[in-house]
């Protein structure tokens, strides 16, 4: 018979034959042959593989480093990685939660809508037209543009969401 060019789901092609993939939680020890099945071994303690695979090494569980404010939210199994979270009152810097911050800052162009608490991180909002923020802050709201008119001045440079307007003297009309 012709050697296969593609294999079924949960199989892989090697040496012109289809071998079974190892199930999640197990790693490949040896490929199948004409006479033997694929040989797999369970991952060791603190290791995992989360897919049907042909990996020869399991992945190490993530370490939740207490020096970075991390603790274990969900212990890993042979089929799942450990999930880290931050100590109470701290917030993850990313979805992967690789480190913790007290709270995040809102970038220039954004103002603080709600200051962080022990439960929720800083909530930022974009500065609308007429307002700006030129700093990174965890407490400052967007500031209104300076009103040149109230100072008897005119706008020399328009404001943006990151910069205030620049006011200047009115042109005096010559008689």
């Amino acid at each position: 018979p012709e050697p296969p060019t593609a294999c079924r789901e949960k199989q892989y092609l090697i040496n012109s034959q289809c071998c079974s993939l190892c199930q999640p939680g197990q790693k490949l020890v040896s490929d199948c042959t004409e006479f033997t099945e694929t040989e797999c071994l369970p991952c060791g303690e603190s290791e995992f593989l989360d897919t049907w695979n042909r990996e020869t090494h399991c992945h190490q569980h993530k370490y939740c480093d207490p020096n970075l404010g991390l603790r274990v939210q969900q212990k890993g199994t042979s089929e799942t990685d450990t999930i880290c979270t931050c100590e109470e009152g701290w917030h993850c810097t990313s979805e992967a939660c690789e480190s913790c911050v007290l709270h995040r800052s809102c970038s220039p162009g954004f103002g603080v809508k709600q200051i962080a608490t022990g439960v929720s991180d800083t909530i930022c909002e974009p500065c609308p037209v007429g307002f700006f923020s030129n700093v990174s802050s965890a407490f400052e709201k967007c500031h209104p543009w300076t009103s040149c008119e109230t100072k008897d001045l005119v706008v020399q440079q328009a404001g943006t969401n990151k910069t205030d307007v620049v006011c200047g003297p009115q042109d005096r009309l010559r008689a």
Epitope: C86, S99, V101, L102, S105, V135
Partner: nanobody, 116 residues
């Protein structure tokens, strides 16, 4: 790497005053927003006060408004918290925090106990 060292805590009677200091070393201090945060025994972290990098803007939690005052001296790389009219509920460990507020830049704190 930035090191933050809080000092000035102690035992004080209700109605008394204390001035906390936070000395920063190993990193630029000027231009960075700074916070005072406290943790009462058995409670979570409470954000008490903040000051902008320029020193022009400040924030105070409602619980300390009118009693606490935050300031900074960039020439001394030091942040201050003047605490007046102290109450029993101000008893806590006080920490300072510097942008970007990472856990590994956290100081040891200074304990303030308000008791008669």
């Amino acid at each position: 790497e930035v090191q933050l060292l809080e000092s000035g805590g102690g035992l004080v009677q209700p109605g008394g005053s204390l001035r906390l200091s936070c000395a920063a070393s190993g990193s630029t201090f000027a231009g960075y927003e700074m916070w005072w945060v406290r943790q009462a025994p058995g409670k979570g972290l409470e954000r008490v006060s903040a000051i902008s990098g320029s020193g022009g803007s400040t924030y105070y939690a409602d619980s300390v408004k009118g009693r606490f005052s935050i300031s900074r001296d960039d020439s001394k790389n030091t942040l201050y918290l003047q605490m007046n009219s102290l109450r029993a509920e101000d008893t806590a460990v006080y920490y300072c925090a510097k942008e970007p507020y990472s856990f590994d830049h956290w100081g040891q704190g200074t304990l303030v106990t308000v008791s008669s």
